[in-house]
Amino acid sequence: CKAMHVAQPAVVLASSRGIASFVCEYASPGKATEVRVTVLRQADSQVTEVCAATYMMGNELTFLDDSICTGTSSGNQVNLTIQGLRAMDTGLYICKVELMYPPPYYLGIGNGTQIYVIDPEPCPDSDF
């Protein structure tokens, strides 16, 4: 069976600055030279694309300039960082990996990483 398994952590807590990082690792059944990584957010039954990047193996992962994601790749592992998160963005973030070239195409979808985001408390006014 030539299936592609994708692994990602079950839970990640975003930093107080609204930044969350996690690793998306895939077991490639072939020798892909072009890979597409997409981060999906599932909330209830709604699925939205958070960001996506296509990269050539051995090269850096490049998201669009206005993307809230950044990342680096190393072999079959992608280190993803999502920034600008707020409490309302808490949810399940799913890593989708596609081996685009050469044929055959393969799809792999992770089980998702539950990212918890806690908005920082505003600093209390000082009496001093």
Partner: antibody
Framework: QVQLVESGGGVVQPGRSLRLSCAAS????????MHWVRQAPGKGLEWVAV????????YYADSLKGRFTISRDISKNTLYLQMNSLRDEDTAVYYC???????????WGQGTMVTVSS | EIVLTQSPGTLSLSPGERATLSCRAS?????LAWYQQKPGQAPRLLIY???SRATGIPDRFSGSGSGTDFTLTISRLEPEDFAVYYC?????????FGQGTKVEIK
């Protein structure tokens, strides 16, 4: 709303060419793989081709032997299927379908009928 | 190429009855979908990932299975459920469909 509308079908003689179009609306066209699937009269579904995202990578069913070409125009939100050297066995309803976020074909057009006959 | 074999070819049932449709793959598949098609209409996605219901699909439709054996169950057939059902694998190219199971009124 999210919609796919095919056009370009009709009756054509064997050996001739035809180009099908699929107009997409209601979603970001470049964020999805787009497929063509066909269905011969009274038969099942047969996958034909896919074009990915920016349109560079394309895959075809082996049975088509290079006669069909899939393409997309992102500026027009339109998917195409150029069919050359048509044969009787290409007679079918041709559907365009969106490869959804999780990979399955979540949105389908209404289909366009192609009849190859002399 | 992964070959999907559906059984039975035709299922004759009455409204209110339970329908069980089978799809067997020639090799293990990771991603399997089910579609419903009514005469003169395009297919409609019912189930993806073997068991997840697509948006707007009633909960009387359920999918199960893994590896090479998959099942679509319609718990209580409604008049609008009489149609042809196709399974499909979509985890790698080429994408393939089963030959279909027709659910008809007995």
């Amino acid at each position: 709303q999210v919609q796919l509308v095919e056009s370009g079908g009709g009756v054509v003689q064997p050996g001739r060419s035809l180009r099908l179009s699929c107009a997409a609306s209601g979603f970001t066209f470049s964020s999805y793989g787009m497929h063509w699937v066909r269905q011969a009269p009274g038969k099942g579904l047969e996958w034909v081709a896919v074009t990915w995202y920016d349109g560079r990578n394309k895959y075809y069913a082996d049975s088509l032997k290079g006669r069909f070409t899939i393409s997309r125009d992102i500026s027009k939100n339109t998917l195409y299927l150029q069919m050359n050297s048509l044969r009787d066995e290409d007679t079918a309803v041709y559907y365009c379908a969106r490869g959804g976020s999780y990979g399955a074909f979540d949105i389908w057009g209404q289909g366009t009928m192609v009849t190859v006959s002399s | 190429e992964i070959v999907l074999t559906q059984s039975p070819g035709t299922l004759s049932l009455s409204p209110g009855e339970r329908a069980t449709l089978s799809c067997r793959a020639s090799q293990s598949v990771s991603y399997l979908a089910w579609y419903q098609q009514k005469p003169g209409q395009a297919p409609r996605l019912l189930i993806y990932g073997a068991s997840s219901r697509a948006t707007g699909i009633p909960d009387r439709f359920s999918g199960s299975g893994s590896g090479t054996d998959f099942t679509l169950t319609i718990s209580r057939l409604e008049p609008e459920d009489f149609a042809v059902y196709y399974c499909q694998h979509y985890g790698s190219s080429p994408w393939t469909f089963g030959q279909g199971t027709k659910v008809e009124i007995k």
